[in-house]
């Protein structure tokens, strides 16, 4: 059994989240994950889900009684989702930590927007980029 | 030329964000995107980047002078990143809008954690999970 299972059960008790009534009014994540079979689509959704859990865990980082459980789960997420790749995890964390209200961050984001957009569609990497993108001058 | 280019230039002017070169170590997103070539890795990162822009645009939704630019860019993001798939976009938006401080959301998230974790690694869908992952102890 993966280590996260026991620790997640521990968290369920802590949050009083074991009862079936918690599942009332639909799911948060599971229903959405069911909709997407294609790996890249799943990554789009899972990226948001993982960042949600990281934020949630951060809110409870000072709570001694669940610290070990949280750390174990985060570590297992690191193995499963980031394939134990520290650089991948660090880049992800960096992205999740940018403050949308920071004026410098806003201006940088706007500055980079055109280049970010040019890379958004899968075709952008394969050399099949539209001529208009190749001609763009920032 | 893609419609977003002109509108992004308009936003640059509005933010007075200039045309100076952005050094690699000074970028928010471009340096990170450069690190990842694998499509699923890119989607993990781009998912965070796109949600950042959506949040940023939400902050400026009442600003008449850039409304058209913002709407055009969002629409182009929809085409490029979500492949014009409304369901994909809606599921994504749903995930980004969950409040991490809402107690009911917290309980649901913890309730679903075990199943979410089980689906995180690509192999989880194919039944070919690595033995090392099965043995991993956090």
């Amino acid at each position: 059994q993966d280590p996260y299972v026991k620790e997640a059960e521990n968290l369920k008790k802590y949050f009083n989240a074991g009862h079936s009534d918690v599942a009332d009014n639909g799911t948060l994540f599971l229903g959405i994950l069911k909709n997407w079979k294609e790996e890249s689509d799943r990554k789009i959704m899972q990226s948001q889900i993982v960042s949600f859990y990281f934020k949630l865990f951060k809110n409870f980082k000072d709570d001694q009684s669940i610290q070990k459980s949280v750390e174990t789960i985060k570590e297992d997420m690191n193995v499963k989702f980031f394939n134990s790749n520290k650089k991948k995890r660090d880049d992800f964390e960096k992205l999740t930590n940018y403050s949308v209200t920071d004026l410098n961050v806003q201006r940088k984001a706007i500055h980079e927007l055109i280049q970010v957009m040019a890379e958004l569609s899968p075709a952008a990497k394969t050399g099949k980029r539209k001529r208009s993108q190749m001609l763009f001058r920032g | 030329q893609d419609p977003y280019v002109k509108e992004a230039e308009n936003l640059k002017k509005y933010f007075n964000a200039g045309h100076s070169d952005v050094a690699d170590n000074g970028t928010l997103f471009l340096g990170i995107l450069k690190n990842w070539k694998e499509e699923s890795d890119r989607k993990i990162m781009q998912s965070q980047i796109v949600s950042f822009y959506f949040k940023l645009f939400k902050n400026f939704k009442d600003d008449q002078s850039i409304q058209k630019s913002v709407e055009t860019i969002k629409e182009d993001m929809n085409v490029k990143f979500f492949n014009s798939n409304k369901k994909k976009r809606d599921d994504f938006e749903k995930l980004t809008n969950y409040s991490v401080t809402d107690l009911n959301v917290q309980r649901k998230a913890i309730h679903e954690l075990i199943q979410v974790m089980a689906e995180l690694s690509p192999a989880a869908k194919t039944g070919k999970r690595k033995r090392s992952q099965m043995l991993f102890r956090g």
Epitope: D102, N104 | N25, S65
Partner: antibody, heavy 117, light 106 residues
């Protein structure tokens, strides 16, 4: 190369007005905002606000609302700071500084305003 | 308003010496900027985005920090480095500067 050239020193009486100019060259004026910074004698730097050179919209710090006005003449790539009803405490050196992509990356040489009766 | 507190207010050092100046912010910020100003001159940008060297600034200058705690280090003081140093934040309105640290020759 980028240059910001400010107008010369001013000696004014209390109650008078002054208008300082900051002429930019070496870049596209409307691509970068312009900050104004005050430095009283022997003191530190105090940000007064900035003007968006594309939209013309000004942002003022609370301490500089009312008697202080930022303006532009984009045809000559110039930004202006006007101070009315001058007081002794307005005696300072005023700098314009380009709101560069990262920070206040280029500064004018400063204009000293002395308010004395 | 975010208050930036620099320490020390004045510091004496010798040429060739390693010097570290600190700047503490009253709230967390994403980036810190550093300027220096020689008497009778306008300020000059040294460091942007906490740790990046501005154009033309010698490599002996470096910046670091995060959250509320930031520092500027000069690895080997040169005669022209004796000046007043200001930290600056433009993460939220109003932009603010530290009160300055004056570096004097010992």
């Amino acid at each position: 190369q980028v240059q910001l050239v400010q107008s010369g020193s001013e000696l004014k009486k209390p109650g008078a007005s002054v208008k300082i100019s900051c002429k930019a060259s070496g870049y596209t004026f409307t691509d970068y905002g312009m900050n104004w910074v005050k430095q009283a004698p022997g003191q530190g730097l105090k940000w007064m606000g900035w003007i968006n050179t594309y939209t013309g919209e000004s942002t003022y710090v609370d301490d500089f609302k009312g008697r202080f006005v930022f303006s532009l003449d984009t045809s000559v790539s110039a930004a202006y700071l006007q101070i009315s009803s001058l007081k002794a405490e307005d005696t300072a050196t005023y700098f314009c500084a380009r709101r560069g992509f990262y920070a206040m990356d280029y500064w004018g040489q400063g204009t000293t305003v002395t308010v004395s009766s | 308003d975010i208050v930036l507190t620099q320490s020390p207010a004045t510091m004496s050092a010798s040429p060739g010496e390693r010097v570290t100046l600190t700047c503490s912010a009253s709230s967390s910020i994403s980036y810190m900027f550093w300027y220096h100003q020689r008497p009778g001159q306008s300020p000059r940008l040294l460091i942007y985005d906490t740790s990046n060297l501005a154009s033309g600034v010698p490599a002996r200058f470096s910046g670091s920090g995060s959250g509320t705690s930031y520092s500027l280090t000069i690895s080997r003081m040169e005669p022209e480095d004796f000046a007043t140093y200001f930290c600056h934040q433009s993460s939220s309105y109003p932009f603010t500067f530290g009160q300055g640290t004056k570096l004097e020759i010992k």
